[in-house]
């Protein structure tokens, strides 16, 4: 007996061939001997089966001795043995219809679980193997679960169902809802304009929800909400913003926040959360702000940084085009009685300059100038 695997919702074509290459009488029946379809001369006739409106054949092939049964919009319950009667002989085809669905929405938040459920006909014992977009293979029976979805899990999952040494392939598009980056860091000189951007790692035609940026300043004992906003069909509107600092927010995606100027009291880290409509849980992105200030008070030239710096970052003071006078893995460095000239304060990571502030030291009788 020939076995054919079909996919729920798809169309299948079961073949039946006569030895004579001409149009002769044929009938397709199910295992209960109920007629599905056949012919009367060149006319297609249909029986009282439940497939009535979904069954068809190809009349153009009858003259060649081919009498296929086409079943559209397959259902699991279409799984059956189908018998083609032609030239006093019977051809049996066993059709097994499978369905594979994500048990929840196919748009899932980062960190959530994905469960794929296989619908299969009674008596079948299929095995399923799925390959994620990042190449990870998972195997299972009627259900497959993937916990802690990551951004790389976004895309087309390819699942292969194996039964009776035959296979059928399903493709399911999964969208992991997340920000492009888990965290970012912005380095600014005191007084400079600061911009934070929170690009999403997915695109949807309609995006509605609400969000908030909580900020923990390094100098503050507790965190505070800097801004709350609504998102309606990808359009951003500010609900509430603190007076200090007075953040500005772009009206379009990606979410874009502007801080008029970087000040030491703003240095710290923030957490932007976005709650999407009809989704449980929130998207998160961490953002960090490091602020640098170079000052000269009397005979002391000081360079300081505030904010979340890693212990391996180097802070140095150097006279332009000269070797560093002082270089430390600390958040403040200073030079006593600095000689006149353009001094540079540098924050660097393994030789790569992350932040630079210049200060001009004038001869001792004048006051310093900051460019």
């Amino acid at each position: 007996k020939k076995v054919v695997l079909g996919k729920k919702g798809d169309t299948v074509e079961l073949t039946c061939t006569a030895s004579q290459k001409k149009s002769i009488q044929f009938h397709w029946k199910n295992s209960n001997q109920i007629k599905i379809l056949g012919n009367q001369g060149s006319f297609l006739t249909k029986g009282p089966s439940k497939l009535n409106d979904r069954a068809d054949s190809r009349r153009s092939l009858w003259d060649q001795g081919n009498f296929p049964l086409i079943i559209k919009n397959l259902k699991i319950e279409d799984s059956d043995t189908y018998i083609c009667e032609v030239e006093d002989q019977k051809e049996e085809v066993q059709l097994l219809v499978f369905g594979l669905t994500a048990n929840s929405d196919t748009h899932l938040l980062q960190g959530q679980s994905l469960t794929l459920t296989l619908e299969s006909p009674p008596g079948s014992s299929p095995s399923v193997q799925c390959r994620s977009p990042r190449g990870k293979n998972i195997q299972g029976g009627k259900t497959l679960s993937v916990s802690q979805l990551e951004l790389q899990d976004s895309g087309t999952w390819t699942c292969t169902v194996l039964q009776n040494q035959k296979k059928v392939e399903f493709k399911i598009d999964i969208v992991v809802l997340a920000f492009q980056k888990a965290s970012s860091i912005v380095y600014k000189k005191e007084g400079e304009q600061v911009e934070f951007s929170f690009p999403l790692a997915f695109t949807v035609e309609k995006l509605t929800g609400s969000g908030e940026l909580w900020w923990q300043a390094e100098r503050a004992s507790s965190s505070k909400s800097w801004i709350t906003f609504d998102l309606k069909n990808k359009e951003v509107s500010v609900k509430r913003v603190t007076q200090d600092p007075k953040l500005q927010m772009g009206k379009k995606l990606p979410l874009h926040l502007t801080l008029p100027q970087a000040l030491p009291q703003y240095a710290g880290s923030g957490n932007l959360t976005l709650a999407l409509e009809a989704k449980t849980g929130k998207l998160h992105q961490e953002v960090n702000l490091v602020v640098m200030r170079a000052t000269q008070l009397q005979k002391n030239l000081t360079c300081e940084v505030w904010g979340p710096t890693s212990p391996k970052l180097m802070l140095s003071l150097k006279l332009e085009n000269k070797e560093a006078k002082v270089s430390k893995r600390e958040k403040a460095v200073w030079v006593l009685n600095p000689e006149a000239g353009m001094w540079q304060c540098l924050l660097s990571d393994s030789g790569q300059v992350l932040l630079e502030s210049n200060i001009k030291v004038l001869p001792t009788w004048s006051t310093p100038v900051q460019p």
Epitope: Q193, K234, G250, K252, P254, T258
Partner: antibody, heavy 120, light 107 residues
């Protein structure tokens, strides 16, 4: 009064480079996203590049990505467009335009434009 | 990418008549459609912004309507000074895309 004045348009050979400038006045330049838009008789108006108010974020359509670089100097109230690997299809009138937003949205003010011709 | 299809390409209308220009987008853009007027040798001038909002200084004979994918720009009583090219721009999503333009002339 908002004013945007483009300059730097020229005749350039295919594969060549050119930098356009746009001097802004009459508004707080550092508070607005800025863009370059070009226009040709056959292709009409086409968005070329956008830069956010502080200059930290830039956006490009695929056809110029990697060839064009938008930048700004907020201290000088000037917007720039550095173009390289120029093609004949880059021939157009280039307009500098302001967004009514710190990042991007629609264009509310346009300059008079400067002409780039790419031809051998 | 959201494509914007503008029609007609050109239009000849008698003074005092009603003018209708249409823009259809390939995706749902809510009400994020904008309209510009451009006269020969000049840059485009902003006429109508998102939400069918008439820009300050634009005469009230100009209006627009639409939501989703279908948008219409209307001039109630055509005047000779309205002879120009008109463009629509979708500002829902990047890349920003324009309609191909409509040349409006006097019949």
């Amino acid at each position: 009064e908002v004013q945007l004045v483009e300059s730097g348009g020229d005749l350039v050979k295919p594969g060549g480079s050119l930098k356009l400038s746009c001097a802004a006045s009459g508004f707080t330049f550092s508070s607005y996203g800025m863009s370059w838009v070009r226009q040709t008789p056959d292709k009409g108006l086409e968005w070329v590049a956008t830069i956010s108010s502080g200059g930290s974020y830039t956006y490009y359509p695929d056809n110029v990505k990697g060839r064009f670089t938008i930048s700004r100097d907020n201290a000088k109230n000037t917007l720039y467009l550095q173009m390289s690997s120029l093609k004949s299809e880059d021939t157009a009138m280039y307009y500098c335009a302001r967004h009514e937003d710190g990042n991007w949205n629609y264009f509310d003010y346009w300059g008079q434009g400067t002409t780039l011709t790419v031809s051998s | 990418e959201t494509t914007v299809t503008q029609s007609p390409a050109s239009l000849s209308v008698a003074i005092g008549e009603k003018v209708t220009i249409r823009c259809i987008t390939s995706t749902d853009i809510d009400d994020d459609m904008n309209w510009y007027q451009q006269k020969p040798g000049e840059p485009p001038k902003f006429f109508i912004s998102e939400g069918n909002t008439l820009r300050p200084g634009v005469p009230s004979r100009f209006s627009s309507s639409g939501y989703g994918t279908d948008f219409v720009f209307t001039i109630e009583n055509m005047l000779s000074e309205d002879v120009a090219d008109y463009y629509c721009l979708q500002s829902d999503t990047l890349p920003l895309t324009f309609g191909s333009g409509t040349k409006l002339e006097i019949k």
